[in-house]
């Protein structure tokens, strides 16, 4: 089976059940349902999944049985529309059920909520978790899939199966350990952090496909796969790009069974043809399916072939550039992007796409000019400032990070971004700026050759979080503009924003700066978030405050928290000292 199956199946549901096996089938249907109906209780979803699974088994037994010929969207949509509380729980999403496929599925997709109103997941005591795991392992793992899927409605479903496998392995090992907590908690922290990163990366892929189209996603994939597999031929890269695009289109479109099946086929193809693709795949290809697919997706770049010729000769100096371009524009541009990317693992994907766009724009203009060759002869000179801009930005920010450390670097970014887009909600500014700040510890440790791809491509992922959160409740024209004009220029667009001079400062509200003794029992991370929330609010009240003023207020605030957390009567300390702090801060900032 290739990724594109030409053979027709009488029953699509039977076909996928047989391909994936019962365990994966049930897990993927649960993920799909939880990603669509994010507010439904776990038990309701399990009931729906069991009904679908029983139906699939009847179709496996007899593909001609009643309704077995229906599409998966029809079957799943019909099942979702049986939920009794649809109108009360989801409001207008219930109107989707009046539509026919494919409009009904599109309607469900449009109602996916990137920031659902769900309680934060609180981790129970280790013994409680281990007991639950031993009492009913299957329910315990299903609950994990459900809770992640409903909070991350675009999570890459086959990858979530991989996370669930690791989650199970962690409990299997650690619940037998002498010190269960020491064994389990670091593993759960790692899974949580990796899961958040995986969710955000996939969200960018889906945004790329849904907001900018297949061509944008394919261009991204050509650049990335050419960097990763520089020894592979262009046709090989093109085939992988086509197949990868199909996989992600399916997952982003809610077609999770097809997506997981096709991803498995793609991994199989890559491993069968690794000699033509990359020398780095050997270890990945010896692993079981879920690990294999994950490993391939994360595999390091292969070594660049020796003696790659200069690109200038055929893409700039040749008199045939316009003839070649006119004959097959997308192939020619694809080849340019492939050739440039495989020579530049040191560039971010978004930079490579900016260069390719500049090249395309130049050819469009010059090939219509009187002397095309004269017109495009200097096109590579136009690349220089595009390359230097992210290089300089990363250099400056890494220096700042090394000087400040992560927490204070995040604070600098909080101030910077609040001044740029003060209309954005405080929780969003805190979340996004904290994540932007993590670029320092993630990327600045790398040598120069790895810094840009690490930093700028990570920033693209984080800024996409800002874009999808802002899209739900748009409040800033500047954010909308940077998010929608160009996918590859989002980061330079945000970088170029200055202080928003049109912003009317927020009214001062003492309640915003009132703190209680509960802050003392918070984890270091939660305490930081409290302080950073206060910092954003300060900037919203006083956008023209200087760095020095803000630093003084924040230092006073840190001292105040430390003092009151050591006090015998903490609550009284917070009440009395808090009033003094607010008054002193107002005076310092001239509020």
């Amino acid at each position: 089976r290739g990724v594109f199956r030409r053979d027709a199946h009488k029953s699509e549901v039977a076909h996928r059940f047989k391909d994936l096996g019962e365990e994966n089938f049930k897990a993927l249907v649960l993920i799909a349902f939880a990603q669509y109906l994010q507010q439904c209780p776990f038990e309701d979803h399990v009931k729906l999944v069991n009904e679908v699974t029983e139906f699939a088994k009847t179709c496996v037994a007899d593909e001609s049985a009643e309704n077995c010929d229906k599409s998966l969207h029809t079957l799943f949509g019909d099942k979702l529309c049986t939920v009794a509380t649809l109108r009360e729980t989801y409001g207008e999403m219930a109107d989707c059920c009046a539509k026919q496929e494919p409009e009904r599925n599109e309607c469900f997709l449009q109602h996916k909520d990137d920031n659902p109103n769900l309680p934060r997941l609180v981790r129970p005591e280790v013994d409680v978790m281990c007991t639950a795991f031993h009492d009913n392992e299957e329910t315990f793992l299903k609950k994990y899939l459900y809770e992640i899927a409903r909070r991350h409605p675009y999570f890459y479903a086959p990858e979530l199966l991989f996370f669930a496998k690791r989650y199970k392995a962690a409990f299997t090992e650690c619940c037998q350990a002498a010190d269960k907590a020491a064994c389990l908690l670091p593993k759960l922290d790692e899974l949580r952090d990796e899961g958040k990163a995986s969710s955000a990366k996939q969200r960018l892929k889906c945004a790329s496909l849904q907001k900018f189209g297949e061509r944008a996603f394919k261009a991204w994939a050509v650049a990335r796969l050419s960097q990763r597999f520089p020894k592979a031929e262009f046709a090989e890269v093109s085939k992988l790009v086509t197949d990868l695009t199909k996989v992600h289109t399916e997952c982003c479109h809610g077609d999770l069974l097809e997506c997981a099946d096709d991803r498995a086929d793609l991994a199989k193809y890559i491993c069968e043809n690794q000699d033509s693709i990359s020398s780095k795949l050997k270890e990945c290809c010896e692993k079981p399916l879920l690990e294999k697919s994950h490993c391939i997706a994360e595999v390091e770049n292969d070594e660049m072939p020796a003696d790659l010729p200069s690109l200038a000769a055929d893409f700039v100096e040749s008199k045939d550039v316009c003839k070649n371009y006119a004959e097959a524009k997308d192939v020619f541009l694809g080849m340019f992007l492939y050739e440039y990317a495989r020579r530049h693992p040191d560039y971010s994907v978004v930079l490579l796409l900016r260069l390719a766009k500049t090249y395309e724009t130049t050819l469009e203009k010059c090939c219509a000019a009187a002397d095309p060759h004269e017109c495009y002869a200097k096109v590579f000179d136009e690349f220089k400032p595009l390359v230097e801009e992210p290089q300089n930005l990363i250099k400056q920010n890494c220096e700042l990070f090394e000087q400040l450390g992560e927490y204070k670097f995040q604070n600098a970014l909080l101030v910077r971004y609040t001044k740029k887009v003060p209309q954005v909600s405080t929780p969003t500014l805190v979340e996004v700026s904290r994540n932007l700040g993590k670029v320092g510890s993630k990327c600045c440790k790398h040598p120069e050759a790895k810094r840009m791809p690490c930093a700028e491509d990570y920033l693209s992922v984080v800024l996409n979080q800002l874009c999808v959160l802002h899209e739900k409740t748009p409040v800033s024209d500047r954010v909308t503009k940077c998010c929608t004009e160009s996918l590859v220029n989002r980061r330079p667009c945000f970088s170029a924003l200055e202080v928003d001079e049109t912003y009317v400062p927020k009214e001062f509200n003492a309640e915003t700066f009132t703190f209680h003794a509960d802050i003392c029992t918070l984890s270091e991370k939660e305490r930081q978030i409290k302080k950073q929330t206060a910092l954003v609010e300060l900037v919203k009240h006083k956008p023209k405050a200087t760095k020095e003023q803000l630093k003084a207020v924040m230092d006073d605030f840190a001292a105040f928290v430390e003092k009151c957390c050591k006090a015998d009567d903490k609550e009284t300390c917070f009440a009395e000292e808090g009033k003094k702090l607010v008054a002193a801060s107002q005076a310092a900032l001239g509020l």
Partner: nanobody
Framework: EVQLLESGGGLVQPGGSLRLSCVAS????????MGWFRQAPGKEREGVSS????????FYTNSVKGRFTISRDNSKNTLYLQMNSLRAEDTAVYYC??????????????????WGQGTLVTVSS
């Protein structure tokens, strides 16, 4: 219509060298992926080396890496294969082929659209 004409084959001793040439006429950007294939008696046709005539990137099958060099002269519409350190197992009919860079794969002869008639290379003492 693209036409390909090979030359340069012949008899050579083990360890010797040969240079094959392939003149292309009528080719365009969509046939700018060019390659050399070979077929030994009773065996399947296999890819030896390919080149993008726009971009200049080259690819080789493992058995000839370090011994064979593919090159092109766009001004003469000619493709070359310099073969050094020849071995008895290199004996075969060598074919020049052309196709679209978006499709051509050295390991799959069916992805090349145009073929020459072939030139025989015999390595024997």
């Amino acid at each position: 219509e693209v036409q390909l004409l090979e030359s340069g084959g012949g008899l050579v001793q083990p360890g010797g060298s040969l240079r094959l040439s392939c003149v292309a006429s009528g080719n365009t950007y969509l046939t700018s992926c060019m390659g050399w294939f070979r077929q030994a008696p009773g065996k399947e046709r296999e890819g030896v080396s390919s080149i993008y005539t726009v971009g200049g990137s080259t690819f080789y099958t493992n058995s000839v890496k370090g011994r064979f060099t593919i090159s092109r002269d766009n001004s003469k519409n000619t493709l070359y294969l310099q073969m050094n350190s020849l071995r008895a197992e290199d004996t075969a009919v060598y074919y020049c082929a052309a196709g679209s860079p978006a499709r051509c794969r050295l390991r799959d002869p069916t992805t090349f659209d145009y073929w020459g008639q072939g030139t025989l290379v015999t390595v024997s003492s």
